[in-house]
């Protein structure tokens, strides 16, 4: 029941999280015009990661897309990547996980396979995670540095008498909505990988069995069943040799956990 | 066609108020703000503030305390109030036309005739 | 505020004659944002109300004749007329659209000769 509730609260604060990240890297407002030295401006300024706009006080809003891909900072090519990485990986993440999810029942998939898909989600949403929270800091990083190269260059001009304001930029609502959605793919995954570990079938210590063939007794040692890690060949949980023998555990095993998801 | 007019009481006592109005035509208050300037006699053109199509207001620093920028959409009707008027509030006042910041005033009103004396 | 300074203040020319006159805004008004200067010119004849000649520094209000052409960017400006006419007496005025308060220049006085 742990289990469910942990792969399903991961799942939860994942597909936010990944929500969260496409959000941001939609947002017009990754960045915004610093109005600490002209807080009377009719012309409000704010950049995103693929147009930047101009919202004047009458309310008229003007946009221009960044019609250029060679013309752009690296950094900013480097954000976009990021982003779209960290969007690509949660969006699969997403999909593998609902196949995964302990709830869904989807033919006679097992738990190590559930197990398997869980981890490897878990896994994608990490990274996905990692990539924007990655992004967003490249982009704040690169903002603060302009922030004080535009600050030091603040006024120019003869003996101070015009003032040329050099405009700068802010943090925008988008970084934040960055970090906590990365910040949220990040610990959604972890949960999964956390999930996994309980929906992995245990090993069993499985009592030594006595198979009887043509008067000859022959002792089979535990280990019958291939201990599955959700990693290993034998992904079905088959005998490795049956030959009729059963151990004692077995006996009473009907109906089997495989049974249920 | 677009049409503003500005009506005012003309004569006002020093420390009174002013209220003055500006009605418009051809065009609606929802899409265009409407700034107010004043000029008094023989010298330059003053900003006093604007109201703009959403309702927002901005206002001259220097008279933001005494001024107050309001209008009825429904009425096509602009509203500037003054209190604590002065003798150098003496000027002409005119209402003028503003789609965005970047345009400029397109249309303005004749202009109404403020006197403050005693 | 931001302080727009006209020059000069007056000037008398004969018609015909081309003339510039200045405007120094003491912030800049260009956005980096829309690469727009926001700053106005306007027209005002005796006994009327100011008339919009150009806006955006450079662009040409619709019905305005095409001898007035403005011209500058960031904190300098210029309103030139190619070819003064007698209907041209009148006092021109920059204004500045960029911050509040929206700030009119004293004004440049032309005269007729």
């Known amino acids: 029941m742990a289990v469910t509730a942990c792969q399903g609260l991961g799942f939860v604060v994942s597909l936010i999280g990944i929500a969260g990240i496409i959000a941001a890297t939609c947002m017009d407002q990754w960045s915004t015009q610093d109005l600490y030295n002209n807080p009377v401006t009719a012309v409000f300024n704010y950049q995103g990661l693929w147009r930047s706009c101009v919202r004047e006080s009458s309310g008229f809003t003007e946009c221009r897309g960044y019609f250029t891909l060679l013309g752009l900072p690296a950094m900013l090519q480097a954000v976009r990547a990021l982003m779209i990485v960290g969007i690509v990986l949660g969006a699969i993440g997403l999909l593998v996980s609902i196949f995964a999810l302990k709830c869904i029942r989807i033919g006679s998939m097992e738990d190590s396979a559930k197990a398997n898909m869980t981890l490897t989600s878990g896994i994608m949403f990490i990274v996905s995670g990692l990539c924007a929270i990655a992004g967003v800091s490249v982009f704040a990083n690169m903002l603060v540095t302009n922030f004080w190269m535009s600050t030091a260059n603040m006024y120019t001009g003869m003996g101070g008498m015009v003032q040329t304001v050099q405009t700068r930029y802010t943090f925008g609502a988008a970084l934040f909505v960055g970090w906590v959605a990365g910040g949220l793919t990040l610990i959604g995954g972890v949960m999964m990988c956390i999930a996994c570990r309980g929906l992995a079938p245990e090993e069993t210590n499985y009592k030594a069995v006595s198979y009887h063939a043509s008067g000859h007794s022959v002792a089979y040692k535990p280990g019958g069943f291939k201990a599955s890690t959700g990693f290993g060949s034998n992904t079905k949980n088959k005998k490795i040799y049956d030959g009729g023998a059963r151990t004692e555990d077995e006996v009473q095993s009907y109906p089997s956990k495989h049974d249920y998801v | 066609q677009v049409q503003l007019k500005e009506s005012g009481p003309g004569l006002v006592a020093p420390s009174q108020s002013l209220s003055i109005t500006c009605t418009v035509s051809g065009f609606s208050l929802t899409s265009y703000g409407v700034h107010w300037v004043r000029q008094p006699p023989g010298k330059g053109l003053e900003w006093l503030g604007v109201i703009w199509a959403g309702g927002s207001t901005n206002y001259n620093s220097a008279l933001m305390s005494r001024l107050s920028i309001s209008k009825d959409n429904s009425k096509s009707q602009v509203f500037l109030k003054m209190n604590s008027l002065q003798t150098d509030d003496t000027a002409m006042y005119y209402c003028?036309?503003?789609?965005?910041?970047?345009?400029?005033?397109?249309?303005w009103g004749q202009g109404t005739t403020l006197t403050v004396s005693s | 505020d931001i302080v727009m300074t006209q020059s000069p203040s007056s000037l008398s020319v004969s018609a015909g004659e081309k003339v510039t006159m200045s405007c120094k805004s003491s912030?800049?008004?260009?956005?980096?944002?829309?690469?727009?200067?926001?700053l106005a010119w306007y027209q005002q004849k005796p006994g009327q109300p100011p008339k919009l000649l150009i806006y955006?520094?450079?662009t040409r209000e619709s019905g305005v004749p095409d001898r007035f052409t403005g011209s500058g960017s960031g904190t300098d400006f210029t309103l030139t007329i190619s070819s003064v006419q007698a209907e041209d007496l009148a006092v021109y005025y920059c204004q500045n659209d960029h911050s509040y308060p929206f700030t009119f220049g004293s004004g440049t006085k032309l005269e007729i000769k």
């Open positions: 003028a036309r503003d789609f965005t910041t970047a345009t400029g005033f397109d249309y």
């Open positions: 955006g520094a450079s």
């Open positions: 912030q800049s008004l260009l956005n980096s944002g829309n690469q727009k200067n926001y």
